[in-house]
Structure formats: structure tokens, C-alpha cells
């Protein structure tokens, strides 16, 4: 049995502009004020960190300036958006939530959201 419960959608289709959004929801056992959210990508048994943000409850998520992720929080829900996706980025994106402060520390891992990215067809040249 996993530790803290984390729920996320099974499948999301990225937009034609390479943007995918999904909600990561966790069942908090305590009254955490500081939460860390990490998005991990799993492909061929390799797991890489896509982005991470630590936020204070009630405040906005702050990702690094060069991050491909943005997000907002509302209670125990985090709305995550990943941009700049290409077809080669199709894969399983796992939401990891850590309740950092105050003690106790709780960790939860979602089952992952399969994000499908389809590169847009190039516009045909028009002879006008």
C-alpha cells in the first residue's frame, strides 16, 4: 500500500501547441503548510525530473524561471501545465507530492498520467 494517496488522470492529450494540463490531487493526513510537488517522466524504466516547485499553502506555485511547468494550487489540488511538448515527449508523467513542513513528512506518488503529444502537420504551401 502506497503512503499518501495521490490522484491524477490516467490520460491527457496535449494541445496542438504542445501544452498539456492535468490536476494532481492529494489526500493530506495532516496540516502541512509547505508542500513540494515534483513532476517525473517515466520512459523505458528511466525516470527523469521534469520540474519541481515548493509552495506555502494558500500561495502560488513557483517553478524556476526556465521551467517548462506552471501551476496553481487550491487546497489539496495542484493544477499543473507542461508546455513546449513535442511528439518525442509522449510518456508517463508522475506527480510526486511531499508534505515538507511542519512534521511529519509525508510522501505520495500518483500512478502517472500518460500524455500523448502529436506534432502538428506543417501547413501546406499555398499558391495564391
Amino acid at each position: 500500500c502506497k503512503a499518501m494517496h495521490v490522484a491524477q488522470p490516467a490520460v491527457v492529450l496535449a494541445s496542438s501547441r504542445g501544452i498539456a494540463s492535468f490536476v494532481c490531487e492529494y489526500a493530506s493526513p495532516g496540516k502541512a503548510t509547505e508542500v513540494r510537488v515534483t513532476v517525473l517522466r517515466q520512459a523505458d524504466s528511466q525516470v527523469t525530473e521534469v520540474c519541481a516547485a515548493t509552495y506555502m499553502m494558500g500561495n502560488e506555485l513557483t517553478f524556476l524561471d526556465d521551467s517548462i511547468c506552471t501551476g496553481t494550487s487550491s487546497g489539496n489540488q495542484v493544477n499543473l501545465t507542461i508546455q513546449g511538448l513535442r511528439a518525442m515527449d509522449t510518456g508517463l508523467y508522475i506527480c510526486k507530492v511531499e508534505l515538507m513542513y511542519p512534521p511529519p513528512y509525508y510522501l505520495g506518488i500518483g500512478n502517472g498520467t500518460q500524455i500523448y503529444v502529436i506534432d502538428p502537420e506543417p501547413c501546406p504551401d499555398s499558391d495564391f
Epitope: C1, A3, V47, I94, P104, Y105
Partner: antibody, heavy 115, light 107 residues
Framework: EVKLDETGGGLVQPGRPMKLSCVAS????????MNWVRQSPEKGLEWVAQ??????????HYSDSVKGRFTISRDDSKSSVYLQMNNLRGEDMGIYYC??????WGQGTLVTVSA | DIQMTQSPTSLSASVGETVTITCGTS??????LNWYQRKQGKSPQLLIY???NLADGMSSRFSGSGSGRQYSLKISSLHPDDVATYYC?????????FGGGTKLEIK
């Protein structure tokens, strides 16, 4: 100051029951998943059981070695957690620690199983 | 169940040295790993949580690192007070298995 006080250990015959208690203070007990962990020279530290809190409907989890014999329970109004141990075996011997989500630990109580 | 393989089982080092203890897991535990210090005759004490975070009141000479299936605990500038047995533990999922422990002694 955080305190966890375990009681109830001692000498017990194989096959007999024993109940351990742990009273906590100094932290918000209801926010914590409470666990029992035991320590023996043969097995080192071994997680035994966990009881989660109200948001998790007081779910219980056990190690395979004690499943069906041990029962963990809690009383948030008394900031207490219990371990009812039935049909005790030699391999259950050790120091039993009560721990709040592994952040805070009690001093331990020794359980000896012998005829 | 997740298996924890801790090494070495014992370690002897001199005051001022830096030592490293490693913990391997049978599957990816996504950083769900704690380290504990247990001194002779005392209860275990949380040292590092979530693989890299130092627990309140613990010396900054202790640091944790790792991800996936491989983790390590580093003790810098060894003190005589660091004599203890150190354990890693999976906290991602039940059963919350512990490593076999590393007994640290001072030369």
C-alpha cells in the same frame, strides 16, 4: 517537549497474548500515522504495524510476519496507540518502539517470549 | 516487498574523516527514503527524511543524496559522538522495510 511512553512489555510464554500501550504528548497526535517498530539482534529494525489517522479512515497495515496475530489500534482522545499481540512466538522477541510517522520515537519496551 | 541492501555492514574511521553509507532498493522508491541513527542503548532518531532533507536538530555534517534505486548518507568531519548504527528505510509503501544497518566505529 515530544514524549512517547511505551508500557506493557515483559516476559510472556509462547502462544500467550500481550498488549502494548503508548501514550504520546508534545505534538498533534491526530496528524500522525502511528507505527510499531521492533528491534532484535537477529533482525535489526523491523517495521511491525501502522495505523493511519482519521483522514485515512484509520487504515491499518501489518508486516507479513505478524498479520493475523497482531492488532494495532488508537484512541485520539487519549493520544494513545496500542498493539494487541496474540499467539506470541520466539521470533517476536525484541524491543518494541512506538513511533509517530517515524519522526518521533519512544524509549521502547522489551518483550521476551520464553517458556 | 521492497528489499533494502545497505552497505557496508560495519565501518571504522578516524575523527575528522568523511564516510559514506549506501542503500540500494529492489525497485524505484522515488526518494521515499529515511535515514536513522541509533546509538547504543537509545531509540532510533530520524536523521534524513525524503532522501535529502535534514531532520530538525541534526548536525549539518550529515547529508543524504540519491534517487531511484540508489541512495547514500554522507557524514563529514567525523566526531566521536557519531558512533552509532545507521539504518535506511523505505517510506514509499508498506511494508516499510529497513536496511540491515551499518555499525560505525571510531579508530
Amino acid at each position: 517537549e515530544v514524549k512517547l511512553d511505551e508500557t506493557g512489555g515483559g516476559l510472556v510464554q509462547p502462544g500467550r497474548p500481550m498488549k502494548l500501550s503508548c501514550v504520546a504528548s508534545g505534538f498533534t497526535f491526530s496528524d500522525y500515522w502511528m507505527n510499531w517498530v521492533r528491534q532484535s539482534p537477529e533482525k535489526g529494525l523491523e517495521w511491525v504495524a501502522q495505523i493511519r489517522n482519521k483522514p485515512y479512515n484509520y487504515e491499518t497495515h501489518y508486516s507479513d510476519s505478524v498479520k493475523g496475530r497482531f492488532t494495532i489500534s488508537r484512541d485520539d482522545s487519549k493520544s494513545s496507540v496500542y498493539l494487541q499481540m496474540n499467539n506470541l512466538r520466539g521470533e517476536d522477541m525484541g524491543i518494541y518502539y512506538c513511533t509517530g510517522t517515524f519522526a518521533y520515537w519512544g524509549q521502547g519496551t522489551l518483550v521476551t517470549v520464553s517458556a | 516487498d521492497i528489499q533494502m541492501t545497505q552497505s557496508p555492514t560495519s565501518l571504522s574511521a578516524s575523527v575528522g574523516e568523511t564516510v559514506t553509507i549506501t542503500c540500494g532498493t529492489s525497485e524505484n522508491i522515488y526518494g521515499g527514503l529515511n535515514w536513522y541513527q541509533r546509538k547504543q542503548g537509545k531509540s532510533p532518531q530520524l536523521l534524513i527524511y525524503g532522501a535529502t532533507n535534514l531532520a530538525d536538530g541534526m548536525s549539518s555534517r550529515f547529508s543524504g543524496s540519491g534517487s531511484g534505486r540508489q541512495y547514500s548518507l554522507k557524514i563529514s568531519s567525523l566526531h566521536p559522538d557519531d558512533v552509532a548504527t545507521y539504518y535506511c528505510q523505505n517510506v514509499l509503501s508498506t511494508p516499510y522495510t529497513f536496511g540491515g544497518g551499518t555499525k560505525l566505529e571510531i579508530k
